[in-house]
Amino acid sequence: QSPPGKPEIHKCRSPDKETFTCWWNPGTDGGLPTNYSLTYSKEGEKTTYECPDYKTSGPNSCFFSKQYTSIWKIYIITVNATNQMGSSSSDPLYVDVTYIVEPEPPRNLTLEVKQLKDKKTYLWVKWSPPTITDVKTGWFTMEYEIRLKPEEAEEWEIHFTGHQTQFKVFDLYPGQKYLVQTRCKPDHGYWSRWSQESSVEMPNDFTLKD
């Protein structure tokens, strides 16, 4: 039996800059029941607070609701482990909510087969930013990727589209069914999950209306 091992805060994420969660790895428990607490202070303040919500985001986590989240302040976060033999603390982690945003995937993914005047066919992929992000005001600057592949293929073909919410894909095989997904990344944050797949069949005949 021994004091608990050092815990580690291994991830913090925010879907929208309005709430965030931090998760920790407990470390060894020293063979004894061990209690974990997350404490934090904010830049320029001496007061230390305890995690406002240990439940919402599951085990070994702390959820900061809107009421507790500010993008103006750096959070200095520590996890403490305590058992009958002693205690240990993680290294303090400095968290700027601006830098932990992992948004929801883009939505309204639509696929349209189009044809140019020279009869060349292409796939026009369009989507909308995630619901919660206020992209129009510049509060979020979002970059996007799309990926597509024939239904039976292993490898995805990825296209970075920058800030565009539409993209034209040329040179696709007639008669093939293609799967398409999109994802987004805010200027300082992390890529979202890939959106749900949409599919489209490229026509065999090229007599399409534009």
Partner: antibody
Framework: EVQLVQSGAEVKKPGSSVKVSCKAS????????MHWVRQAPGQGLEWIGV????????NYNQKFKGRATLTVDESSSTAYMELSSLRSEDTAVYYC???????????WGQGTLVTVSS | DVVMTQTPLSLSVTPGQPASISCRSS???????????LHWYLQKPGQSPQLLIY???NRFSGVPDRFSGSGSGTDFTLKISRVEAEDVGVYFC?????????FGGGTKVEIK
């Protein structure tokens, strides 16, 4: 304890490439972005770029785009910075540096001196 | 790129006396989120740089309170209220509001 341990000094010829490694320990490697910064002899610091080890997303200083390549090996918790088409002005100490979830550098490697000389 | 200009280039200070380093940026350093990402690092002889001050005026963990930062917009200052022997080295200001992140040329602090 967070540690970033870099590979040893290198002497390279102009026009060649160098690959510097940075082995991370004491934290979850994929959870934090890894930056690279260099310092020419007696000079200031220059940011080269950053990589997200969780999905290898990179962002480069335009000055180094096309010449610097940042990669990671998740299995060994190691980050790499390769610089090609070396010239004498690339003689510098190269540092890997980790932030927290912030945009400054909390932890630094010990530095790797790269000397470019014919 | 944002150019960071530090003055003076070097400083020789008597122990116990104050010291002040100025840093001027070629563009305003207020981020779109309202924060000002101006930081100060100290590089002691033969060592890697270490963070002293983040976001203009916040002392990093373990940094003595004799170090303080101030400023706004394009003009920033690092002050050491009473210089000690262990404070020798090169001080760098750095901005991370605009990509690429950039650093000042450094100010070398020596003890008289």
């Amino acid at each position: 304890e967070v540690q970033l341990v870099q590979s040893g000094a290198e002497v390279k010829k102009p026009g060649s490439s160098v690959k510097v490694s940075c082995k991370a320990s004491g934290y979850t490697f994929t959870s934090f972005w890894m930056h690279w910064v260099r310092q020419a002899p007696g000079q200031g610091l220059e940011w080269i770029g950053v990589i997200d080890p969780s999905d290898t997303y990179t962002n480069y200083n335009q000055k180094f785009k096309g010449r610097a390549t940042l990669t990671v090996d998740e299995s060994s918790s190691t980050a790499y910075m390769e610089l090609s088409s070396l010239r004498s002005e690339d003689t510098a100490v190269y540092y890997c540096a980790r932030g927290d979830y912030s945009n400054w550098f909390t932890y630094w490697g010990q530095g790797t001196l790269v000397t470019v000389s014919s | 790129d944002v150019v960071m200009t530090q003055t003076p280039l070097s400083l020789s200070v008597t122990p116990g006396q104050p010291a002040s380093i100025s840093c001027r940026s070629s563009q305003r350093l207020v981020h779109s989120n309202g924060n000002t990402y101006l930081h100060w690092y100290l590089q002691k002889p033969g060592q890697s740089p270490q963070l002293l001050i983040y976001k203009v005026s916040n002392r990093f963990s373990g940094v003595p309170d004799r170090f303080s930062g101030s400023g706004s917009g394009t003009d920033f200052t690092l002050k050491i209220s009473r210089v000690e022997a262990e404070d020798v080295g090169v001080y760098f200001c750095s901005q991370s509001t605009h990509v690429p992140w950039t650093f000042g040329g450094g100010t070398k602090v020596e003890i008289k």
